[in-house]
């Protein structure tokens, strides 16, 4: 199915806004810059989430699935 991943309406995609606090969903809060898809070599970088590339820094970051936290969405959020 072409839409098997979380739909953009619900996955926190807008967390890329330069002035938005993204601590809940990305590896850094108030991260500046723009995003693209992570290169293929990062296919499994995010354990429970979607990888996106910080264009200006050329580094991967993760948008975690609901209920997961951590730099690579590797930890269950006990407060979820």
């Amino acid at each position: 199915d072409g839409n098997s991943t979380r739909s953009p309406e619900t996955n926190g995609l807008l967390c890329g806004d330069p002035d938005e606090n993204c601590a809940a969903t990305t590896t850094q809060s108030k991260r500046k810059g723009h995003f693209s898809r992570c290169p293929k070599q990062y296919k499994h970088y995010c354990i429970k989430g979607r990888c996106r590339f910080v264009v200006t820094e050329q580094t991967p970051s993760c948008v975690c699935d609901e209920g997961y936290i951590g730099a690579r969405c590797e930890r269950v959020d006990l407060f979820y």
């Epitope: 953009p8 995609l13 807008l14 806004d17 995003f35 898809r37 070599q41």
Partner: antibody, heavy 119, light 107 residues
Framework: QVQLLESGGGLVQPGGSLRLSCAAS????????MSWVRQAPGKGLEWVSG???????TYTDSVKGRFTISRDNSKNTLYLQMNSLRAEDTAVYYC?????????????WGQGTLVTVSS | SYELTQPLSVSVALGQTARITCSGD??????VHWYQQKPGQAPVLVIY???DRPSGIPERFSGSNSGNTATLTISRAQAGDEADYYC?????????FGGGTKLTVLG
Amino acid sequence: QVQLLESGGGLVQPGGSLRLSCAASGFTFSSYAMSWVRQAPGKGLEWVSGLGHVGYTTYTDSVKGRFTISRDNSKNTLYLQMNSLRAEDTAVYYCARDYLDFGYYFDVWGQGTLVTVSS
Amino acid sequence: SYELTQPLSVSVALGQTARITCSGDKIGKKYVHWYQQKPGQAPVLVIYDDSDRPSGIPERFSGSNSGNTATLTISRAQAGDEADYYCQAWDMQSVVFGGGTKLTVLG
């Protein structure tokens, strides 16, 4: 249903300008990156420009400095301002939705609008 | 800049298997997507991420990607499969398309 509808194409002289519009419906327009892709008569597809959901823009080399991509999320509309048009810009221009961020694939396309640059 | 090379045309007999290739330097390290375009119509995504099929695309369409070549395979080719097919990848913050392949279904 999810739909993209381009408009604004037509005949323009070399050196002239044109603004294309792409009206989106059936999805949360502001959440998606969008792109323009063109196809010259009898030729293949050529990506022209892309615009991220937070304003990041990127262009193919041949249109840099001449074309400007923009969006109005309140109107669910994508634009392509084309200046200093050349004969080689003659093509059908398609508006396409990038799946999620840049770097994915185009999962929704409009039907295209024809731009003809000729004297 | 990155280039994707496709054969200009491929012919297949009705009911047989067609294979369309897309060549590029270390293309296996990139995600490759395939679009079908019929005359006078907009392109339609038929394969994404090398081998995944969007909903509504028949199982006869499949893809693979390794080394320097990505391949779109169309099994049990039908007359309605006759179209132009384009591969696409992402390189250095820009989109790259192959030149396109015209698939002709014979018989």
